[in-house]
Interface confidence: medium
């Protein structure tokens, strides 16, 4: 949870001749006001897709009304700044949309009047947590000069506010892996002093003068890979005689994660998949209503009207979870045939074909099969930007001109003798044996060595394997 | 495809009170504006009260102001009419409607009908004295 942070410094006619002297010229008294819109990822979008991380509108600014005679001074600014609070992780990467808008107040028949005065796109790549960013960009011939940063709020921590520090009062500790924060250092426990040498990048601990191991890693000060230890795969705290590994808790031990949810380990930590109506890291966050906005990156919320009613979140596409928090990765399902390249652009997939290949899926082969001919009734099947005939019984070959014995290759067992056959092959099977390829033993008493009867059929139906 | 629905419509006495609400589906940009505007038999089409999406920014008719609040409910995608003190000159058929000042720079006005793209099928208010 955070919120991202935007100040307009100054907003007027930029340098240089033919720029404006008011935004009010010859129009009457009006006043600007600005519109902030931020959408995830660095892509170009249209300016009508929706703000998916979230948008705001400032006040009104003061009533300006152009002194003819005057220099033109820098016009009167709303006051405050520009939040849009973002609840899940902030991106890093995004698109910041500033637009300026002048409101006339002239005796207008129906209302005042609205315009667009000039919009700036920045695309940007910005850390939760850093200082103020300054910019100056020109829109035709205004400039707007303005600053901006993402900060986290509540417990959250780090460069996409995602981890959370723990106050002191809270009763448990700041916990592995958490280190004081920054804007807390008062408030969270110092992380407890490791054993002397202890691995900075492989150990870590819990009590002052450990040193554990994280996974993949072993010996006393967690510098040795576990590969070349006989404790391969086990976790926790380096045993001093044997420098193995003791089992040690894994980060979904315990199920952090409240509420019903469940808990998956990922690198180093974990992620929970919450139940409705919870939400979070922990999905310690409850109670929640479609009033509260719960329904992440555009999911449309419905729920009843009772207000501890329920609701469910429906995602639009590219994105799952009861809140509509987790992008699919929907190039992990891997659509792209014959080696292509799969890009998801977030609102379609798109694939790069290999050479010879193309189609949505790269699912055509351009030349394989063109021109070619299988003999003698074979089928040509396209693959691996070379042509491949499928042949029919009893012929072979890259064109299946060849004429093929099926009995070449010796398919009866035990002694069976083999006759080639117009529709593939016959096995005549030596006393005690059985099958289509006289592979099964027959006992003596009768009852043979027949594998469990596939499903469908009971120990007492005739078994048709011949 | 933008859908607006109407609800809450109906008979009052003078004096009385409705809340008429518009449930809003495919309509996502946020600097849009979602209204209210009313048209009684024979009459044109007046603005009544509009909010901007997102920004809180509202503006009301002389005629409404101080009896009637327009509000939203973003994550419901829902505007809300509020009519208090209702008169029997505030009979008319109440139409939801949502749109959008142009990028172009062209005017723009937040309470007259030209410029909203959507309009939904009305709701019946009638004040009788």
């Known amino acids: 949870a955070g919120v991202f942070e935007l100040q307009i410094h100054s907003f007027g006619p930029g340098p240089g001749p033919g720029a404006p002297r008011s935004p009010c010229s010859a129009r009457g008294p009006c006043r600007l006001f600005f519109r902030v819109c931020l959408k995830p990822g660095l892509s170009e979008e249209a300016a009508e897709s929706p703000c998916a991380l979230g948008a705001a509108l400032s006040a009104r600014g003061p009533v300006y009304t152009e002194q003819p005679e005057a220099p033109a001074p820098d016009l009167p600014l709303p006051n405050g700044l520009l939040q849009v609070p973002f609840r899940d992780a902030w991106p890093g990467t995004f698109s910041l949309i500033i637009e300026t808008w002048r409101e006339e107040l002239g005796d207008q028949i129906g209302g005042p009047a609205w315009s667009l005065l000039a919009r700036v796109t920045r695309r940007r790549r910005l850390a939760a947590g850093g200082p103020w960013a300054r910019d100056i960009q020109r829109a035709g011939a205004w400039e707007l000069r303005f600053s901006y940063r993402a900060r986290c709020e509540l417990l959250a921590v780090g460069t996409a506010c995602t981890r959370l520090c723990r106050p002191r009062s809270a009763p448990s500790r700041c916990g592995p892996g958490l280190r004081p924060c920054a804007p807390l250092e008062d408030e969270c426990e110092a992380p407890p002093v490791c054993r002397a040498g202890c691995s900075l990048e492989h150990g870590f601990c819990e009590q002052p003068g450990e040193c554990r191991c994280l996974e993949g890693w072993t010996g006393p000060l967690c510098t040795v890979p576990a590969s070349t230890s006989s404790c391969l795969g086990l976790r926790g705290p380096s045993s001093a005689t044997t420098g193995c590994l003791v089992p040690g808790p894994g980060p979904c031990d315990g199920n952090p994660c409240a509420n019903g949810g469940s808990c998956s380990e990922t690198p180093g930590s974990f992620e929970c998949t919450c139940p409705r109506g919870f939400y979070g890291l922990r999905c310690e966050v409850s109670g929640v209503t479609c009033a509260d906005g719960p329904c992440f990156n555009g999911g449309l919320c419905v729920g009843g009207a009772d207000p501890d009613s329920a609701y469910i979140c429906h995602c639009p596409p590219g994105f799952q979870g009861s809140n509509c928090e987790k992008r699919v990765d929907r190039c992990s399902l891997q659509p792209c045939r014959n080696g292509g390249l799969c890009l998801d652009l977030g609102h379609a997939l798109r694939c790069r074909c290999r050479a010879g290949f193309a189609g949505p899926r790269c699912e055509h082969n351009l030349d394989d099969c063109a021109g070619r001919a299988c003999a003698n009734g074979g089928t040509c099947v396209e693959g691996g930007g070379a042509h491949r005939c499928s042949c029919a019984l009893g012929f072979g070959g890259r064109d299946c001109r060849e004429r093929a014995d099926p009995c070449a290759a010796r398919p009866c067992a035990h002694g069976g003798r083999c006759y080639a056959h117009f529709s593939g092959l016959v096995c005549a099977c030596a006393p005690g044996y059985m099958g289509s390829r006289c592979e099964f033993p027959v006992h003596p008493d009768g009852v043979s060595a027949l594998p469990a009867a596939p499903p469908g059929l009971r120990p007492g139906d005739p078994q048709r394997y011949l | 495809e933008v859908q607006l629905v109407e609800s809450g419509g109906g008979s009052v006495q003078a004096g009385g009170s409705l809340r008429l609400s518009c449930a809003a589906s495919g309509y996502t940009y946020s600097s849009n504006f979602m209204g209210w505007f009313r048209q009684a038999p024979g009459k044109e089409r007046e603005g009544v009260a509009t909010?901007?999406?997102?920004?809180?920014?509202?503006y009301y008719a002389d005629s409404v102001r101080g009896r009637f609040t327009i509000s939203q409910d973003n994550a419901k995608n829902t505007v809300y009419l509020q009519m208090n003190s209702l008169k029997p000159e505030d009979t008319a058929m109440y139409y939801c409607a949502a749109g959008g000042p142009p990028t172009n720079g062209a005017k723009w006005y937040p309470l007259r009908p030209p410029g909203y793209n959507y309009w939904g099928q009305g709701t019946q208010v009638t004040v009788s004295s």
């Open positions: 909010i901007v999406s997102g920004g809180g920014t509202t």
